[in-house]
Interface confidence: medium
C-alpha cells in the first residue's frame, strides 16, 4: 500500500449501513479490511469490490479500489484487504523506473546484438552484444530488418497498451 495517500484515494462511505460489520478498535487502530468511525469507537468494514485497507489503520475511509485500465488485465480482484492487481497486456511491460506506464515491447534487437530474454509484463526483451555478451541499456526501437522511426507518442498512464 502506498505511503502517499491523497483525498482522492479515500472512498467516502455513508454512515455504516446495517450490513456493515462493526468491531472495536485495538489501541486506536482497526484491522485490515476496516476503517475507523468518526467518533473513533468502531471499526467499520470496507465494501468488497469497492474499497479496501491492507494494514492496521486509523483511516476514516477505506482506500478506493484501483480499476485496471483497458490496456491491462486483472490478475486478481479487489477484496476488502487487498487492492486490485493489474498486469500489462501481452506484448507490453511496466518499467521499474516508471511503474505506472506499460510500454510496447521491442520486437527485435539492434544490429550486432542478440536476444537473450523475452518480453514479459515486467521487462522488455533483453539484448546483449554478440561479441562481448554485455547487456544493452537504452531503447532502440528500430528492428534489424526494418528501417523505423521511433513512435512519437509517449507511454501512457491511461489506457496502457492501446
Amino acid at each position: 500500500e502506498s505511503a502517499l495517500i491523497t483525498q482522492q484515494d479515500l472512498a467516502p462511505q455513508q454512515r455504516a449501513a446495517p450490513q456493515q460489520k462493526r468491531s472495536s478498535p485495538s489501541e486506536g487502530l482497526c484491522p485490515p479490511g476496516h476503517h475507523i468511525s468518526e467518533d473513533g469507537r468502531d471499526c467499520i468494514s470496507c465494501k468488497y469490490g469497492q474499497d479496501y485497507s491492507t494494514h492496521w489503520n486509523d483511516l476514516l475511509f477505506c482506500l478506493r479500489c484501483t480499476r485496471c485500465d483497458s490496456g491491462e488485465v486483472e490478475l486478481s480482484p479487489c477484496t476488502t484487504t487487498r487492492n486490485t492487481v493489474c498486469q500489462c497486456e501481452e506484448g507490453t511491460f511496466r518499467e521499474e523506473d516508471s511503474p505506472e506506464m506499460c510500454r510496447k515491447c521491442r520486437t527485435g534487437c539492434p544490429r550486432g546484438m542478440v536476444k537473450v530474454g523475452d518480453c514479459t509484463p515486467w521487462s522488455d526483451i533483453e539484448c546483449v552484444h554478440k561479441e562481448s555478451g554485455t547487456k544493452h541499456s537504452g531503447e532502440v526501437p528500430a528492428v534489424e530488418e526494418t528501417v523505423t522511426s521511433s513512435p512519437g507518442t509517449p507511454a501512457s498512464p491511461c489506457s496502457l497498451s492501446g
Epitope: 483497458s70 490496456g71 520486437t107 513512435p151
Partner: antibody, heavy 118, light 112 residues
C-alpha cells in the same frame, strides 16, 4: 517519414464482404498498435478495434465484435479490416491509425470510402 | 461505454478571436494511480483525416502551435484557441482513453 497508405474507394453490394488495407511506411507495425476508426457522413468518429501486429492480439468495441475482423501481415507491414454481411449502415469512411502505447492516435491514414449499394 | 458530450456543436468566430469549447465525460477520466486525465483532442479539416492536438488533457503534441491549450480534469475539459487563424477552421473532437476509446460528437469551428 511515418505514413499509413490505405486502399481506395470500395463500392460493394449489400450482404457482401469487403477487406480494406492499410500499409505502413517509416516504421515497423510490430512496434505499435494499429487501430481502425469509422466515420459516417456528417457524423462523428467511432473506434472499431485494434491489433497488436507483434502477436496478432485484437481488441474490438463490442458493437463491432463479430462484424469486423482485423488482421496483420507483418512481412508487408500491412493491416487489414474485413467486414462481413454489409448493410447501408456500414457505408462510411474508414481510417487506420497508429497508437504506440496508448489509445491516442498520432498518425492516420487518408481514409477508405466504403459505399454499399442494394 | 463512457459517453463524451461536446458543446457547442458549432461555433462562428472571427480571426484573432479567443475561443473555447467544452467536452464532458459521463465518468471521471482521471487515473487514480497516475493522476493523469485520459483525454485527447483532435482537429479534422474538411476532406482530411483527424490530427492529434492534445493528449493527457493538456499535453500538446509536437508541432502543434501553442495557441492551442487543453485544460480540465475529471469529467470537464476545455480546448482553448487563444487567437483563431483561418487555418483553424475545422471540426474538433475530444476522445477518452480511460476505457475503450469513445469520441465526442465534435464542435465545428466556422468563420463569422
Amino acid at each position: 517519414e511515418v505514413q499509413l497508405q490505405q486502399s481506395g474507394a470500395e463500392p460493394v453490394k449489400s450482404g457482401a464482404s469487403v477487406k480494406l488495407s492499410c500499409t505502413a511506411s517509416g516504421f515497423n507495425i510490430k512496434d505499435t498498435f494499429i487501430h481502425w476508426v469509422k466515420q459516417r457522413p456528417e457524423q462523428g468518429l467511432e473506434w472499431i478495434g485494434r491489433i497488436d501486429p507483434a502477436n496478432g492480439n485484437t481488441k474490438y468495441d463490442p458493437k463491432f465484435q463479430g462484424k469486423a475482423t482485423i488482421t496483420a501481415d507483418t512481412s508487408s507491414n500491412t493491416v487489414y479490416l474485413q467486414f462481413s454481411s454489409l448493410t447501408s449502415e456500414d457505408a462510411a469512411v474508414y481510417y487506420c491509425s497508429r497508437g504506440t502505447t496508448v489509445y491516442y492516435f498520432d498518425h492516420w491514414g487518408q481514409g477508405s470510402t466504403l459505399t454499399v449499394s442494394s | 461505454d463512457i459517453v463524451m458530450t461536446q458543446s457547442p456543436s458549432s461555433l462562428a468566430v472571427s480571426a484573432g478571436e479567443r475561443v473555447t469549447m467544452s467536452c464532458k465525460s459521463s465518468q471521471s477520466l482521471l487515473n487514480s494511480r497516475t493522476r493523469k486525465n485520459c483525454l485527447a483532442w483532435y482537429q479534422q479539416k474538411p476532406g482530411q483525416f483527424p490530427k492529434l492536438l492534445i493528449y493527457w488533457a493538456s499535453t500538446r503534441e509536437s508541432g502543434v502551435p501553442d495557441r492551442f491549450t487543453g485544460s480540465g480534469s475529471g469529467t470537464d475539459f476545455t480546448l482553448t484557441i487563444s487567437s483563431v487563424q483561418a487555418e483553424d477552421l475545422a471540426v474538433y473532437y475530444c476522445q477518452q482513453s480511460f476505457d475503450l476509446p469513445t469520441f465526442g460528437g465534435g464542435t465545428k469551428l466556422e468563420l463569422k
